[in-house]
Structures are given as C-alpha cells and as structure tokens.
Amino acid sequence: EEELQVIQPDKSVLVAAGETATLRCTATSLIPVGPIQWFRGAGPGRELIYNQKEGHFPRVTTVSDLTKRNNMDFSIRIGNITPADAGTYYCVKFRKGSPDDVEFKSGAGTELSVRAKPSAPVVSGPAARATPQHTVSFTCESHGFSPRDITLKWFKNGNELSDFQTNVDPVGESVSYSIHSTAKVVLTREDVHSQVICEVAHVTLQGDPLRGTANLSETIRVPPTLEVTQQPVRAENQVNVTCQVRKFYPQRLQLTWLENGNVSRTETASTVTENKDGTYNWMSWLLVNVSAHRDDVKLTCQVEHDGQPAVSKSHDLKVSAHPKEQGSNTAAENTGSNERNIY
C-alpha cells in the first residue's frame, strides 16, 4: 500500500482580522494509526496550535469529526484571527508509539496572512501657537495595519500638500505596522477656519480612506492691528478717543489705556465682533477730560494678546488748542502716532 501523504492544498490563506481562518489538511491513508497535530512554524521552536489527542484549544475547531474511525480530514478553523496569528501552519501526522507518539509526516505548510485595517489617523499640531508666515509641523499616526503597503496624503482645505515625510515601521517583516508622517504647513492670516487633514488608504479599506483632522484655529495666533482715533467732542471739556483692535485670534486680549504713561484703565475684550475669516474686532474708548490737563496728553492704547508681549499705539492730544478745533483736526494729530513693543 502507498505510504501516507499529508496534503495541505492551500499554499497560502488570506484572512481579515476578526474573521475565522480555515486551514485545510487531509491524509491519503488511515495507516499508520496515530494523531494529527497542527503547528505554527517549523523546527524546535515551533508553536503547538492543536493536538487531536489532548489539550485545550479554545480558538480552534475541527472541520470534521476526528473521532470517526475512517476520518482523513484534519482541517481546522481558527477563530477571531489577529495579525499575531500570521505565519506558516503545518499539519503533522504522528505514529502511535510508546511512551510517546513519533512524528511521521508533515504537510507542506499553509502560510496564513492576516489583513488588518489601520487605526483612525490621529493628527497633532505644535504645542505652541504660531503667527502667519511661520511654518508649523503636524504629525499623523496610524497603527496596527497589515500588509505593510499603505498610502498617506496630507491636505489643507482639500488641497494636497507636498512638504511631508513619512515612515512605516518596522522596516522588516512584522505581524502589523505603524505609519508616522510629519507635514510642514505655512500659516496665513486667513487660516483660522482652515483644516489640515491626514488621509490613510490601505487595501483593507477598499478605496475608502480614513481621515484625521486638525483645526488650524488651535495652532494659529493672528496678532491685532491697532488704530487710535480722536472722535469729535462730546462735551465742552471732553474728548473721546477710541482704540480699534482689529483682526486678532484667539479672543484672549487685555487692553490698557495710559495717559502720559500712567495707567488709566484696563479691560478685557468681551463683546467682540467676528469677521468672516474667523478673526475678531474690538473697540475700546476713553473719555479724556481736557481741562484736567495743563500740558499736551500722550494717550497710549496698550494691548496684550494671548499672553504675548504688549503692542501699543499712541496718540498725542494737544491741550493748547480749543477742544472743538481738535475734534475737527483728527488726521493731523494722528501723524505722530507710533507703534512699539513694550517689554
């Protein structure tokens, strides 16, 4: 009679993570008598997956009833497959022996490949805010996918970015892989409403990429522009001076009025108006009693925005002239105003 052969008809089996893998194995003869065992890998370090004779293998079920006398089908099913199950599986026939069974013949092996989808990409931006014209870095990470081949793209408001570097780890063979990418983005004043998107495409996703997003509102700081103007006279001895704080983001802003270098009033921006681009405008006014001053008054609007060094704009109020005349001469008085940093 022809010697028993162990046949594993499938050279390779591809299974999605979470699914059940069927590993097929048949013997060509009932002789010699003895059990079948399944191993992952070959050689002394091989891992026992299933033993027909003894042991507890909760994830493994047999396709046919191995207790039947004439059974020659030793196929198994492994449930809830994970990338860690990838490898080559061998169906091995043992001959009954004493005290131990002896390995008789092995199948050619079936390579189990596991497809696992990438995790949702996580995008993170810089720790500190940056101002327009500066370049900031965003990172994108996704893990746990297999096979290794993957596509990663970056977008800003739907437009593809080209300045990025991507690594897939590990470089060699592994049960699953991770991707890490860093993109450089140049900020503009209009970026408060902008979004950066990292998109990951993988064979398991079947054309529908996963996306991770970051809002540039978390990253950008748009410093305000200041304008100090003198309004027409409110009363005989009073002048109304306004400080227009324009196009700033985020909202956190504190304004201080100084009269000849002395603090007159400090307030925090509350009732701001929002511009279309997401930046804010705010206006503060100061009522100056001209009769209380003998000399010219230097009024300074000092703004501290989002914890940054203060910026200021000054306006010279001439007391010598009649108040009513001053109100009609706003433009001329503003020529001497200057912007400077106060540290």
Partner: antibody, heavy 123, light 107 residues
Framework: QIQLVQSGPELKKPGETVKISCKAS????????VNWVKQGPGKDLQWMGW????????TYVEDFKGRFAFSLETSASTAYLQINNLKNEDSSTYFC????????????????WGQGTSVTVSS | DIQMTQSPASLSASVGETVTITCRAS??????LTWYKQKQGKSPQLLVY???TLAEGVPSRFSGSGSGTQFSLKINSLQPEDFGSYYC?????????FGGGTKLEIK
C-alpha cells in the same frame, strides 16, 4: 472573467421581506467592496451605500437606514441586500456593483455591475 | 450632502455629431467624479473616472474634463451605440450622489 450575478425578479406584498443575492466570480471577493444602487421607475440612479467585504463594515445613505441591510457570505463570494417591511415605493431595480480602487487604494468608481434585480411590491 | 446637477436632461443628436453633457456639483469635489453610461434595460457601465481618465475599453471619442464644481463629458463623432442615458457621480466623501441623468436620443 469578472462577473456579478444577481438573483431573479421578486414580486412581494407590502410588509414582506425580500433578500437579493449578488454572487461574484473571477476575482478575490474579499479584495473589493460591494455597492448597492437603486433605480426607480423614473430611471434615476440612487447610491444606497456599500459593504467592505474585508472588514464587513457597512455604510448606508440616510434614506436607506433602518429597513435595509447589507450582508455577506464570504465563503460563497456572495453579497446580499435585504429589505424589510416592504413598501410600494421600494418597487425598483436593485444593482450590486464592485467598487474599484487604484494602485494607491483610492476608490474611483464601480467597474463591474450585476444585471439588476427587479422588485415589485404590490398588494 | 453634495448635490449633483446634470444638464441637459435630454438631448437629441445625429450620428457623427459632437455632444457635450455637463455636471455641476453643489460644492468643490476636486476631481472626484465618475461618468457612467446606461443602455435601456441594461446595467450602467463605467466610462470616465477621476473626471478625465477613460476606463478600460472605452473609445477615445469620449473625453471628460473639469474640476472643482464644473465637469463635462464630450462625445465626438457619435456612434449608434452611444445613445442611452449618462450619469455623473461624485465620490468626495459619503453619500456618493448621482446626477439626475442625461438621455441622449437619436435625432
């Protein structure tokens, strides 16, 4: 060659359930998604959603959430569309179609279609 | 949801003529647009993808163009087999909505 073969026409009463099959051949079934498209008597096409044959996750368009269910029998390379509690407005032809993607794994369209299954709902 | 508007709804032309069908998206869909052709009583067939790439086996008399919100499908030198309905569909996110279709008839 690649083929998607759908089950035959169905005549049902309102309130009943119908299950349409779509058997794929000529390619590895679990490599490509299966889309479902409805074509009403007015002849307009409506994308109902799709099922990822690898992860088994389904995406449904808002209009098709609830009574509609996509399912798979991967060992038989078959996708199913089940419609519960049938209504008169479900009378249409239903197509299954394979979702194609490029070398970078980006979807670009439906490259192979089933022949369509006509469902008539009438009391 | 993104709306796709096709025009004209119907069109009569003669064999040998050149026709253009347009498709407008309610918002920017970049080049994520596909064109399908459907003959009476048959399944739709993929014609053009990514706005301008011809699908395998599609004759060169067909051409797609456009990006953003405006797209068109041009058929040069119409052949008898070109008559039928044409649909555009976007795939910029979900749901992947179709246009209302354009019925191309023989004059």
């Amino acid at each position: 060659q690649i083929q998607l073969v759908q089950s035959g026409p169905e005549l049902k009463k309102p309130g009943e359930t119908v299950k349409i099959s779509c058997k794929a051949s000529g390619y590895t079934f679990t490599d490509y998604g299966v889309n479902w498209v409805k074509q009403g008597p007015g002849k307009d096409l409506q994308w109902m959603g799709w099922v990822n044959t690898n992860t088994r996750e389904s995406t449904y368009v808002e209009d098709f959430k609830g009574r509609f269910a996509f399912s798979l029998e991967t060992s038989a390379s078959t996708a199913y569309l089940q419609i519960n509690n049938l209504k008169n407005e479900d009378s249409s032809t239903y197509f299954c179609a394979r979702g194609a993607y490029d070398a970078y794994y980006y979807y670009y369209g439906m490259d192979y279609w089933g022949q369509g299954t006509s469902v008539t709902v009438s009391s | 949801d993104i709306q796709m508007t096709q025009s004209p709804a119907s069109l009569s032309a003669s064999v040998g003529e050149t026709v253009t069908i347009t498709c407008r998206a309610s918002e920017n869909i970049y080049s994520y647009l596909t064109w399908y052709k459907q003959k009476q009583g048959k399944s739709p067939q993929l014609l053009v993808y990514n706005a301008k790439t011809l699908a395998e086996g599609v004759p060169s008399r067909f051409s797609g163009s456009g990006s953003g919100t405006q797209f068109s499908l041009k058929i040069n030198s119409l052949q008898p087999e070109d008559f039928g309905s044409y649909y555009c569909q976007h795939h910029y996110g979900s749901p992947r909505t179709f246009g209302g279709g354009t019925k191309l008839e023989i004059k």
